[in-house]
């Protein structure tokens, strides 16, 4: 159980079962496709929702890297393993007992292996670039207003701590929000930002898994900042291992 | 690691209250209730009431409902106990606990707690 | 409200002896899921009680195998195998199905 349960739904994942079976008849949700119980109170882990979401279709993508360790997920959806708090695990293996290593955000960073993969610890991404392409609008929008509705959104919806949030820059249609999170600046209860970006791509995409809210309705003093394209970049905090550039 | 820091001793004068804290560290505040337990001197535990910092709701048990009011102050991570018209039969020990996650199954249990705060009702 | 009791009171012991603490409900524990919240805690003088096992049988992060938990409904047992000194102090069960929740009176193990 925990908080903002209380009419028994879990407003920050709609993947999930609820019911009034734990102490005192409080409510407890569960993660689909795992059972694992989850923390209403704030963004669900993208190991759980990628698990809960397993039986979506694939969705790769390939894209054009900022840097030559940036990593993307051209894999597309897998059903991951996710530790007892919803991390991934750092080896992956599917049902043919091919395993490679992970990233944080679940993200693969090394060539595919078998069994004998060692994958020593789970790597950070402690840096994700998201670069959007807006819709044309009648003006460019002015840069703090995108700015400062951007922090907002990811303080507000998705509970991301503001120092997180390290830049947002804009070259109309362009808009790239940078996120960056070390492993020693990450406290106690606070978002990972690799989950913030996992909600905030449900939401541009209009598959947002927040129970009964709208979807994401983005405005810039009141003009709709609609997103057509969406690119998500990721750095880990020891770059990844593949044997030849991909 | 989890840290429950309650203050050591309360001194406090018949018919007046005392607010007792709880300051939570190394986990989620938000994410898990919080209990109080009392324990009377030479006597065994008895179950306060629980509150669940990220909305504030709260659950009593009947015995302490005019006696207790529990709050939480999010923004500080601290969970708070008022303790109203004060008598010798609350002289006592009190300790916040935190309550289990559904994650490792421990649902309904205590696994840490708070030091305890000794209040001595006297005039 | 739920009443426990816990037998025997006290509880004196050689180091080295295997014990059993019970723990009675005066209604059943396991809720219409299935669920039954009954956790055993450990309190020794001077400090803040400590949890032992939870949800009957499981045992908390840290706690020796030698501490094991049965029991279901209104019946519960807390089994220690080879006392050790650091064993010793209040044992309490407590129960977090229905409201108001309740402790047992406490079983205090002592050496003989």
């Known amino acids: 159980h925990t908080a903002a349960q209380d009419n028994c739904t879990c407003p920050t994942n709609k993947m999930t079962v609820c019911s009034p079976d734990g102490p005192g008849g409080r409510c407890q949700c569960r993660a689909l496709g795992s059972g694992v119980a989850v923390d209403c109170s704030t963004l669900t882990s993208e190991c759980l929702l990628l698990k809960a979401r397993m039986s979506a279709p694939k969705n790769a993508r390939t894209l054009v890297r900022p840097n030559e360790h940036a990593l993307v997920d051209n894999d597309g959806l897998y059903d991951p393993d996710c530790d007892p708090e919803g991390r991934f695990k750092a080896r992956q293996c599917n049902q043919t007992s091919v395993c490679w290593c992970v990233n944080s955000v679940g993200v693969r960073r090394t060539d595919k292996g078998d069994l004998s993969l060692r994958c020593d610890e789970l790597v950070r991404t402690h840096h994700i670039l998201i670069d959007l392409r807006h819709r044309p609008t009648a003006g460019a929008f002015n840069h703090s207003d995108l700015d400062a509705e951007l922090r907002r959104l990811f303080r507000e919806r998705y509970r991301l701590h503001p120092k997180f949030v390290a830049a947002v820059h804009y070259e109309q249609p362009t808009i790239q929000i940078e996120l960056r999170q070390n492993t020693s600046q990450k406290a106690a209860g606070d978002v990972d930002i690799g989950d913030a970006a996992y909600y905030f791509e449900r939401d541009v995409k209009g598959e947002s898994l927040f129970q009964g809210r709208g979807g994401l309705d983005l405005r810039v003093r009141g003009e709709p900042l609609q997103v057509e394209r969406t690119l998500i970049y990721y750095l880990d905090e020891i770059p990844p291992k593949f044997s030849m550039k991909r | 690691q989890v840290q429950l820091q309650q203050p050591g001793a309360e001194l406090v004068k018949p018919g007046s209250s005392v607010k007792l804290s709880c300051k939570a560290s190394g986990y989620t505040f938000t994410s898990y209730w919080m209990y109080w337990v009392k324990q009377r001197p030479g006597q065994g535990l008895e179950w306060i009431g629980e509150i669940n910092p990220s909305n504030g709701r709260t659950n009593y048990n009947e015995k302490f409902k005019s006696k207790a009011t529990l709050t939480v102050d999010k923004s500080s991570s601290t969970a708070y106990m008022q303790f109203s018209s004060l008598t010798s039969e609350d002289s006592a020990v009190y300790y916040c606990t935190r309550e289990g996650h559904n994650y490792d199954g421990s649902l309904g249990a205590m696994d840490h707690w708070g030091q305890g705060t000794s209040v001595t009702v006297s005039s | 409200d739920v009443v426990v009791t816990q037998t025997p009171l006290s509880l004196p012991v050689s180091f080295g002896d295997q014990v059993s603490i019970s723990c009675r409900s005066s209604q059943s524990l396991t809720n219409s899921y299935g669920n039954t919240f009954l956790s055993w805690y450990l309190h020794k003088p001077g400090q803040s009680p400590q949890l032992l096992l939870y949800?009957?049988?499981n045992r908390f992060s840290g706690v020796p195998d030698r501490f094991s938990g049965s029991g279901s409904g209104t019946d519960f047992t807390l089994k220690i195998n080879t006392i050790k000194p650091e064993d010793l102090g209040m044992y309490y069960c407590f129960q977090s199905t229905h409201q108001p929740y309740t402790f047992g009176g406490g079983t205090k193990l002592e050496i003989k």
């Open positions: 949800g009957i049988s």
